[in-house]
Every structure is written in C-alpha cells, then in structure tokens.
C-alpha cells in the first residue's frame, strides 16, 4: 500500500484580543487531521487540539499562564480517514507559526464606556474596565489588572451641535473634563498601550452622548 | 527507545488509597501527556486521567472524579495515580500510556495488578 | 457517553483466513483507534485515525469506516494474530473503548 501524501499546514496566523488567543491556519483538511503544539522558548512542546479538522485551536489557556512569555506554536498533518497509508516512525509533517508574545501584540478589544456623570459643568466618563481570561489566584484579572499604567485611554468628546473634537488621556480608568453648561456632549474612547510597536491602539468605542441613558445629570 | 516501567502488584484492603508509579525514560518526560487507563478481570479498558508534567495540567473521567489524583515528578520522570476510597470494583491492571504521533495512547506500561480485599 | 459495541464478541478462525471485525458506536464519531492485547499484555496500538498503521504494525491489518460503523481486517491470519483486539473513540469525553473482539484458533 503505497504512503498517504499530508499537506503542510502554511499561513500560521495568531488572532488574539485582550488575551483571548486562537491560531489560525490553512488548508482545510482533505483526508488529513491536524494537532497543535505549544511552546515557549525554554519550555516544552505541549499537544492541544489533537487530531483536529478544524483550522484553528483556542491556545487561550495556555498563553494567559504567562502573558509576557513569547510563544511558539507549530502544526502536525496527520493521514486519516479511508486513506491508504503504510506505518511510519518519522515525525509527520508540520509547520512553525510566528512568535507571539501576547503581553506586546494582544489586539486591545473595543472599549466600552460604562457610565458618565454631570456635575455642573465637570463630567465624569468612566470606561469599563473590561475582564480578561488572564487569571491569578483562581480570579480572572481585568485589563487594567494585566497592563497597569502602560494603558491608557484617550477620550475623544464633542459637543452635539458641533464636529471639532477635543481630547484626554488618563492611565485610570476614568476621565474627569470642563464642559460648557447647558451643553450636550457626546463621547468616545480609545484603548492605547504608548510603549507598544504594534497592535498600539484599540478600535474607538460606540459613540455616547448625553441626554441618553447611560448618563446621570446633577446640576449644583 | 520509550519505556514505561510501573511499579509492583497491590492489594488493598476496602476504603484505603492505592498510588501507582510509572517511570519514563527514553524521551524527554515533561513534553508529552500521560495517561492512565485500567482494566477490570476479563473487561475492558477505561480511561481515568492524564497529565502533562510539563506544567502538571491535568483532566479526569468524571466517573472518577474526587477520587483519582494524578501527579508528575519531572526530576524522577516518573507519574503517579492515586485512587481513594477503594471498593472491590477497583480491583483491576492499571496502565500508565503516552501520546504518540497520531494517537494518545502509543506506548504503555506493563501494568500493575491492584486487587481490593478484605 | 459514546458507546462502542463490537461485534463478534468471539470469532473463531483457522490460520490464512481473513478476519473482519466491526465496531458500532451510539454516536457518529470522527475517526477510530485499534489495539490488540495479548493475555498478561499491555494492548498494542495497531490502527490510527481509521485506517493508518502504527509504526511496525504489519500490512495485513488495514482499517475503514465512518460515522458510526468501523472495520478491522486482517487479510490473512498469521498464528500471531490471535489475540483480543479493541476498538477506541477520543471524539468525545471520555475516551472509549469496545469491549473487545476475541480472535481464537478454530
């Protein structure tokens, strides 16, 4: 019976926002299965996904261990099915991914604002700070919890009858800016990490604007 | 060449916990999944639980689950189950067997007769 | 769980016979493993991912199927060959295992 030919998976790709991380690949399997195996450089190959159809595999549990580790990840074509195939001790085929460093190249998700509050002419915004899958001492951290001080965001805001846009930073989670009374504004946010080379900023939240309800409105 | 040696025969007196060994050699023991999987007299196989020693990862059957525990001394290269709470039902050959290319349970250990008795 | 169901449960054959084991399970299942297992014995992996032959496995044994029905065949029977052999599904939790075809001498 003659050897079963396995394609080599190719275009290793990582997808992974706030630390929510899956390796993609191609082709879509043709008599052939894949598994996955992850490693980071000092460590040891560790075997996820086995024996798969799909082109892809959830590594999530694997890099939150550890998010500022680099990550190596590599793909293993296997012969299965009602193929004809001869027994072999070789290693199969397999192809390397990227490295991926999740704490650098995390895509930062779109952010959301909880909540904004006027008094007087101060608003409060206030971004949720959004929980991740990185966990330490069996609770899940949040994104602030993970990146500390190298995030911040940048608030964008603007009153309703007019285009020109103003903008704050803050490495908390919460913006506190002067608005003219009797004004309404409109807001939105942008997740950055400065330091970053890559991936440095997030998608801008959905626009929120007063006089809707996610606002509470208190005149002194 | 992988060799799995589990350690002797038990016999256990009803309620008490067994531990079994399987010591590795021939490959590098923290990079694959162990696994263990037993055999009742004159029945089939059942799978109770692996380990990756690489990092102690660890899943069980939920038919066991409370009472297996299965651990990995990476400096002996040798894995370990511990069944508790023993009834006769237990008796039976526990195997201790690594993954391989393309199956998880390539290679087994000899393995170890535990009987319960009163 | 998925249960697998083989059948013969005894298959009593001459040496040279061809020997056809099939394996049913309660669900569809992606791919099948097969063992064989000799008294005193650990079982020895024989077939992988339905039809691939674990390294030094003869080429005698050959495996097929899909879904919900699997086959082993031993094209002829070599003294060796008699022995239990067991089919297994990892497409689901728990793994699973047959209970177990026995292949004695007629």
């Known amino acids: 019976s003659g050897t079963t030919n396995t394609v080599a998976a190719y275009n290793l790709t990582w997808k992974s926002t706030n630390f929510k991380t899956i390796l993609e690949w191609e082709p879509k399997p043709v008599n052939q299965v894949y598994t996955v195996q992850i490693s980071t450089k000092s460590g040891d190959w560790k075997s996820k996904c086995f024996y798969t159809t799909d082109t892809e595999c959830d590594l999530t549990d694997e890099i939150v261990k550890d998010v500022k580790q680099t990550y190596l990840a590599r793909v293993f074509s296997y012969p299965a099915g009602n193929v004809e195939s001869t027994g072999s001790a070789g290693e199969p085929l397999y192809e390397n991914s990227p490295e991926f460093t999740p704490y650098l190249e995390t895509n930062l998700g779109q952010p959301t604002i909880q909540s904004f509050e006027q008094v007087g002419t101060k608003v409060n915004v206030t971004v949720e700070d959004e929980r991740t899958l990185v966990r330490r001492n069996n609770t899940f951290l949040s994104l602030r919890d993970v990146f500390g001080k190298d995030l911040i965001y940048t608030l964008y805001y603007w009153k309703s009858s007019s285009s020109g846009k103003k903008t704050a930073k803050t490495n908390t989670n919460e913006f506190l800016i002067d608005v003219d009374k009797g004004e309404n504004y409109c807001f939105s946010v942008q997740a950055v990490i400065p330091s970053r080379t890559v991936n440095r900023k997030s998608t801008d939240s959905p626009v929120e604007c007063m006089g809707q309800e996610k606002g509470e409105f208190r005149e002194i | 060449q992988v060799q799995l040696v589990q350690s002797g025969a038990e016999v256990k007196r009803p309620g008490s916990s067994v531990k079994v060994s399987c010591k590795a050699s021939g490959y590098t023991f923290s990079s694959y999944w162990m696994y263990w999987v037993r055999q009742a007299p004159g029945q089939g196989l059942e799978w109770i639980g692996q380990?990756?020693?690489?990092?102690?990862?660890?899943n069980y059957n939920e038919n066991f689950q409370g009472r297996v525990t299965i651990t990995a001394d990476k400096s002996t290269s040798t894995a370990y189950m511990e069944l508790s709470s023993l009834t006769s039902e237990d008796s039976a050959v526990y195997f201790c067997?690594?993954?391989?290319?393309?199956?998880?349970?390539?290679?087994w250990g000899q393995g170890t007769l535990v009987t319960v008795s009163s | 769980e998925i249960v697998l169901t083989q059948s013969p449960a005894l298959l009593s054959l001459s040496p040279g016979e061809r020997a056809t084991l099939s394996c049913s399970a309660s669900?569809?299942?992606?791919?099948m493993y097969w063992y064989q297992q000799k008294p005193g014995q650990a079982p020895r992996l024989l077939i992988q991912l339905t039809s691939n032959l674990a390294s030094g496995v003869p080429a005698r044994f050959s495996g097929r199927g899909s879904g919900t029905d699997f086959t082993l065949t031993i094209s002829s029977l070599e003294p060796e060959d008699f022995a239990v052999y067991y089919c297994?599904?990892?497409?689901?939790?728990?793994?699973?295992f047959g209970g177990g075809t026995k292949v004695e001498i007629k």
């Open positions: 067997t690594r993954e391989g290319y393309g199956n998880r349970f390539a290679y």
């Open positions: 297994q599904q990892w497409s689901y939790n728990p793994p699973t």
């Open positions: 669900s569809s299942v992606s791919y």
């Open positions: 380990i990756y020693p690489g990092d102690g990862d660890s």
